[in-house]
Interface confidence: low
């Protein structure tokens, strides 16, 4: 089954089919009997309920809101509501680049070392059954590959492989032809030696908080492309519904390494969140490095020397 749409901020290109899938979809038995509502709000309009009559381009299924296709005026906030479950997304629909086969702002960059294994597979599991054919383009020139359902490149990388690779899926829906484009900017680089990853800032951080408020703990590291950064907390990671690990952000440094940042968001801080360790770890092939955060009630700040506090 296709995963749900967990990212709260989404950018998508106008004119393409698009869908939002809420994350309580696994509760299949509840779904059938419970009232479910999708809402949109944008600018002056506050929480307008969506239904198939809202637009001929919108289709509603149990778990999914589909756009056939998504257009610029679909930009806004979307909400799914079922019993006491709510999920929200902010959708930004951007203009298609009419002079290219892809839109620059919707490109995924990937760095591959020369002579290392290089793979591109064109796949789209959600629309799989509707896809008639798929083409793979390099710098907007069609590549002639055997498989026109899931075109694939698998090889050891050479410098000539550098470029923009666009997977274009062609599909029919209600008698109309649509296409979905996914583009990868592949950069081929010389063999690079690894650094020992390092977490930035002090190893132990006391964070002054107020009960009922929210806090964002930011963990930053300098690391190699394949290193991982993750949060660990509590007995079972992720058992607290008020704790959310945000999407990792990465920026490449001029030396070809990565500056990574991962935020742990704790909402509606309770007593159970105080005086426990929230550990951020960076793990590489050479081992791990960890830094810890402890939430302390503002009233108790006087007990701790000022220099150990972070904001």
């Amino acid at each position: 089954a296709e995963s749900c749409t967990s990212r709260p901020h989404i950018t998508v290109v106008e004119g393409e089919p698009f869908y939002l899938k809420h994350c309580s979809c696994s509760l299949a038995h509840e779904i059938e009997t419970t009232t479910k509502s999708w809402y949109k709000s944008s600018g002056s309009q506050e929480h307008v309920e969506l239904n198939p009559r809202s637009s001929s381009r919108i289709a509603l299924h149990d778990c999914v809101l589909e756009f056939w296709p998504v257009e610029l005026n679909d930009t806004g906030s979307y909400f799914f509501q079922m019993k006491n479950y709510t999920q929200k997304w902010k959708l930004n629909v951007i203009r298609r680049n009419k002079h290219s086969c892809f839109t620059e702002r919707q490109v995924t960059s990937k760095i591959v070392e020369v002579k290392k294994f290089f793979q591109i597979t064109c796949e789209n599991s959600y629309y799989q059954t509707l896809v008639n054919s798929t083409s793979l383009y390099k710098n907007c020139k069609k590549l002639l590959l055997e498989n026109n359902k899931n075109p694939t490149i698998k090889k050891n990388a050479e410098f000539e492989d550098q470029g923009y690779y666009s997977c274009v899926h062609f599909l029919h829906h209600n008698g109309k032809l649509f296409n979905i484009t996914k583009t990868f900017n592949i950069t081929i680089v010389e063999d690079r030696s690894n650094i020992v990853p390092v977490l930035l800032g002090p190893k132990l951080n006391h964070v002054a908080v107020e009960l009922g408020k929210n806090v964002r703990l930011n963990c930053s590291a300098l690391l190699n492309e394949e290193d991982v950064i993750y949060w660990m907390f509590g007995e079972e990671n992720g058992s607290d519904p008020n704790i959310h690990e945000e999407k990792e952000m990465r920026i490449m440094t001029p030396e070809g390494k990565w500056h990574a940042s991962k935020v742990l968001r704790i909402e509606n801080i309770g007593e159970s969140n105080l005086n426990v360790l929230y550990n951020c770890t960076v793990a590489s092939t050479g081992g791990t490095d960890t830094k810890s955060f402890i939430l302390v009630r503002k009233a108790d700040m006087a007990d701790i020397p000022g220099h150990v506090f972070t904001r």
Partner: nanobody, 115 residues
Framework: EVQLVESGGGLVQAGGSLRLSCVAS????????IRWYRQAPGKQREWIAS???????NYADSVKGRFTISRGDARNIGYLQMNSLKPEDTAVYYC?????????WGQGTQVTVSS
């Protein structure tokens, strides 16, 4: 999205062997390295082995010479062959992959080594 499922854990006597599998399903474009970690009760999750997209391998000192990491021909499956197991190898074993710099973890498989 990538989903990971580990299997092959269980109860084994010291000196015995187990082979763990990690299968990545879903969208597996640019799942480059497969890594294994383990977490013993009350301890930090620790890295134990990696295999990169070009099949070069790396091991933590604690398992070097006893554990072997490999990947299947389909490239979306990783293995951890564990020989000469010791009681201190008891832990939940997790596999991890990265796709476009998002980390994906499996649910883990329990390995218990009795003396």
């Amino acid at each position: 999205e990538v989903q990971l499922v580990e299997s092959g854990g269980g109860l084994v006597q010291a000196g015995g062997s187990l082979r763990l599998s990690c299968v990545a399903s879903g969208s597996t474009f640019s799942v480059n390295a497969i890594r294994w970690y383990r977490q013993a009760p009350g301890k930090q999750r620790e890295w134990i082995a990696s295999i990169t997209d070009s099949s070069s391998t790396n091991y933590a000192d604690s398992v070097k010479g006893r554990f072997t990491i490999s990947r299947g021909d389909a490239r979306n499956i990783g293995y951890l062959q564990m020989n000469s197991l010791k009681p201190e190898d008891t832990a939940v074993y997790y596999c991890n992959v990265m796709k476009n710099w998002d980390n994906y973890w499996g649910q883990g498989t329990q390995v218990t080594v009795s003396s």
